[in-house]
């Protein structure tokens, strides 16, 4: 008796975070024996879509011409071979940006900060939101969530960083979101360049979360410290 069919691989091109109106292609790769591919979307009737395999039959394409709110969500795919259906793929989370107006990102007291000092990145939205995300460009673990407790709506979130080291320097953007769908994000804020001076011999910050020892400085997750004053927001790592 053969074991279960291996699970397919599911991915999105050009990526899984897509601006409203832009195209995205979801690919499901199985085996050469695949006869049919099926894509399921969480909380939607199954199957969400079916496609015949593209030659040489080991993958299928699911096309989304223009990203809208309807497409944001969690997907899994399967393939059917002569012996039956495969295991489900690992999930793919498709996130749409542009659902809400862009927040404003600023640095207090200044985006030019001396190593060893403190800086707070402030993400402010025009309308109350309950989730704020800070993203650092070219970081392997770029997302830091601040999510309000008990559904309280906030106009801003503070991301304190102390002590600042060279690792913190770089380009940041923030997004805001509502808790009812973390697959829908605002337009990105304008970029903020955080410049750390006097940091040639800075020690690495001690992480507050375990990180792979293979990670280099740019792979380090953001390490804000301290409380989040008066915000009612709770920190979540992604």
């Amino acid at each position: 008796q053969a074991g279960p069919l291996p699970k397919p691989t599911l991915w999105a091109e050009p990526g899984s975070v897509i601006s409203w109106g832009n195209s995205v292609t979801i690919w499901c790769q199985g085996t050469l024996e695949a006869r049919e591919y099926r894509l399921d979307k969480e909380e939607s009737p199954a199957p969400w879509d079916r496609q015949n395999p593209l030659e040489p039959k080991n993958k299928a394409r699911f096309s989304i011409p223009s990203m809208t709110e309807d497409y944001a969500g969690r997907y899994r795919c399967y393939y059917r071979s002569p012996v039956g259906w495969s295991q489900p793929s690992d999930p793919l989370e498709l996130v749409m940006t542009g659902a809400y107006s862009k927040p404003t990102l600023s640095a207090l007291p200044s985006p030019l900060v001396t190593s060893g000092k403190s800086v707070t990145l402030l993400c402010q939205s025009r309308s109350p939101m309950d989730t704020f995300l800070l993203i650092k460009e070219r970081a392997a673990h770029p997302l830091l969530h601040l999510r309000s407790e008990h559904g309280a709506q906030q106009h801003q979130a503070e991301f304190p960083m102390s002590p600042v080291t060279s690792v913190h320097g770089g380009t940041y953007r923030c997004f805001s979101s509502h808790g009812f769908s973390h697959y829908l994000l605002s337009h990105p804020s304008d970029p903020l360049e955080l410049i750390v001076s006097g940091s040639l011999e800075d020690p690495r910050p001690s992480p507050t979360r375990s990180v792979s020892t293979a990670a280099g400085p740019e792979d380090q997750p953001l390490m804000p410290t301290g409380s989040v004053p008066h915000s009612g927001l709770r920190r979540h790592w992604e």
Epitope: S23, S63, P65, Y71
Partner: antibody
Framework: QVQLQESGPGLVNPSKTLSLTCTVS????????WSWIRQPPGKGLEWIGY???????NYNPSLKSRVTISVDTSKNHFSLKLSSVTAADTAVYYC?????????????????WGQGTTVTVSS | DIQMTQSPSSLSASVGDRVTITCRAS??????LAWYQQKPGKIPKLLIS???TLQSGVPSRFSGSGSGTDFTLTISSLQPEDVATYYC?????????FGQGTKVEIK
């Protein structure tokens, strides 16, 4: 059977604003992209822009500074405004529908078109 | 912006001939391509979307192929009623640009 009908003045003075409306009958505006396309006499098709049911828009960069597309879901219609018109804006103007979500049939192309309305820019 | 280039701009063929129209995108557009037929004095009609998916009611002599940058519309056996101008159009990310059109006539 969904039908689209363009309406608006057939003659517009130069430098004025062209205003057209497309009325959607026999179906919903929801989950579709609604486009305006034009065709100058004897020439090809030119995409002007689209609006989604949420009100989000995208425009042809060559016309963006002069174009506004809006939607009124309660009246089941969407509209085009093109400002500062010249003789080069003389054309047949079409409204058209493109599916916005799986299951809406067209899978990407514009599957329903209005009959078109001729707009002449002249004094 | 991505440009769409059709060739030829016009062609003349006999009834029963196999006719091929090509459309080239200046950058890859996956399979986000539609083909339209516009008969003289009429409105455009969607023939094919997703590069190769035939719309319901379109005769099977029409077919589409291609992905990425190079696409083809084929009429396997040209009929008198196929006299029209054919347009390709990209519909991935805006702008949804049309090709300049290919006019098909009967010899």
């Amino acid at each position: 059977q969904v039908q689209l009908q363009e309406s608006g003045p057939g003659l517009v003075n130069p430098s004025k604003t062209l205003s057209l409306t497309c009325t959607v009958s026999g179906g919903s505006i929801s989950r579709y992209f609604w486009s305006w396309i034009r065709q100058p006499p004897g020439k090809g098709l030119e995409w002007i822009g689209y609006i989604y049911d949420s009100g989000s828009t995208n425009y042809n960069p060559s016309l963006k500074s002069r174009v506004t597309i809006s939607v009124d879901t309660s009246k089941n219609h969407f509209s085009l405004k093109l400002s500062s018109v010249t003789a080069a804006d003389t054309a047949v103007y079409y409204c058209a529908r493109r599916g916005g979500y799986y299951g809406s049939g067209s899978y990407g192309g514009m599957d329903v078109w209005g009959q078109g309305t001729t707009v002449t820019v002249s004094s | 912006d991505i440009q769409m280039t059709q060739s030829p701009s016009s062609l003349s063929a006999s009834v029963g001939d196999r006719v091929t129209i090509t459309c080239r995108a200046s950058q890859g557009i996956s399979n986000y391509l539609a083909w339209y037929q516009q008969k003289p004095g009429k409105i455009p009609k969607l023939l094919i979307s997703a590069a190769s998916t035939l719309q319901s009611g379109v005769p099977s002599r029409f077919s589409g192929s291609g992905s990425g940058t190079d696409f083809t519309l084929t009429i396997s056996s040209l009929q008198p009623e196929d006299v029209a101008t054919y347009y390709c159009q990209k519909y991935d990310s805006a702008p949804w640009t049309f090709g300049q059109g290919t006019k098909v006539e009967i010899k």
